[in-house]
């Protein structure tokens, strides 16, 4: 599930990881676009074991997942802008 938030007023990620997490172990992905008090895009991943990690947006594996989710979202009806969930 992918969520896009536009409401954060500060950065949430202190450090970012580029360590690969297969999508089968990902529960949820939250994207905070840059702006609103944070100068960078942030990607937060909730794993199936309940742990949470900030992921480097430049990591190739997360870009592949994002691209796949974008493709899937383009074939489903739109949902509210503030919180987009893409299965």
């Amino acid at each position: 599930v992918l969520e896009v938030y536009y409401t954060h007023l500060r950065c949430r990620c202190v450090q970012e990881s580029s360590v690969f997490i297969p999508r089968r172990f990902i529960d949820r992905i939250q994207i905070s676009p840059r702006g609103n008090g944070c100068p960078r895009k942030e990607i937060i991943v909730w794993k199936k074991n309940k742990s949470v990690v900030c992921v480097d947006p430049q990591a190739e594996w997360i870009q592949r997942i994002m691209e796949m989710l974008r493709k899937k979202s383009s074939s489903t009806p739109p949902v509210p802008v503030f919180k987009r969930k893409i299965p």
Partner: antibody, heavy 123, light 106 residues
């Protein structure tokens, strides 16, 4: 040649504990996630646990969560499965398997498997 | 949890023939399906991953296809060593195996 050799199986009473081991060779063990999968007497395959390449992340299905613990020793090229509070439904052949490449980005499944070690839970 | 319904549970076929096994997922698994061959006394052997990608060293007699919830696996020109039990595995959301298909010589 990739080799995975399981050991530690046996007969154990319900409520008891057992620790399985898997010795890996023929590949860079510390670069791969590893998994345990079991085959029940009815010949069904069930995923049991997965651990990341560095050992920091572990994942379990609900039916073993809190009872089983997967761990690894990258210095010894060994994978472990500590099983406690065992039930009759845990009776199975237990296989260790090499999982995804931790430094990559390909979502590949388990590719090499051992020959298994048998666990029987019975009073 | 995702369920995988594999069929048939058993089938018999002749040498040189062709067989097809199907797996239906309880939800879209985005082509993240693998197929394994399992023989007694050995560990399962990965044949195909990501629906249709053959593992190195696996002959092209083996093939896979599908999308969404529906997937199939075929073996053509059956050889004696092909008679075994076959399992599908979804790895889109944790792991779930199909119930297996035992392939026997007719």
């Amino acid at each position: 040649e990739v080799q995975l050799v399981e050991s530690g199986g046996g007969l154990v009473k319900p409520g008891g504990s057992l620790k399985l081991s898997c010795a890996a060779s023929g590949f860079t063990f510390s670069s791969y996630a590893m998994s345990w999968v079991r085959q029940t007497p009815e010949k069904r395959l069930e995923w049991v646990a997965t651990i990341s390449d560095g050992g920091s992340d572990a994942y379990y299905p609900d039916n073993v969560k809190g009872r089983f613990t997967i761990s690894r020793d990258n210095a010894k090229n060994n994978l472990y499965l500590q099983m406690s509070h065992l039930k009759s439904e845990d009776t199975a052949m237990y296989y260790c398997a090499r999982d995804y490449y931790g430094s990559g980005y390909e979502d590949s499944p388990m590719d090499y498997w051992g020959q298994g070690t048998s666990v029987t839970v019975s009073s | 949890d995702i369920q995988m319904t594999q069929s048939p549970s058993s089938l018999s076929a002749s040498l040189g023939g062709k067989v097809t096994i199907t797996c239906k997922a309880s939800q879209d698994i985005n082509k993240y399906i693998a197929w394994y061959q399992h023989k007694p006394g050995k560990g399962p052997r990965l044949l195909i991953h990501y629906t249709s990608t053959l593992q190195p060293g696996i002959p092209s007699r083996f093939s896979g296809s599908g999308s969404g919830r529906d997937y199939s696996f075929s073996i053509s020109n059956l050889e004696p060593e092909d008679f075994a039990t076959y399992y599908c595995l979804q790895y889109d959301n944790l792991y779930t195996f199909g119930g297996g298909t035992k392939l026997e010589i007719k």
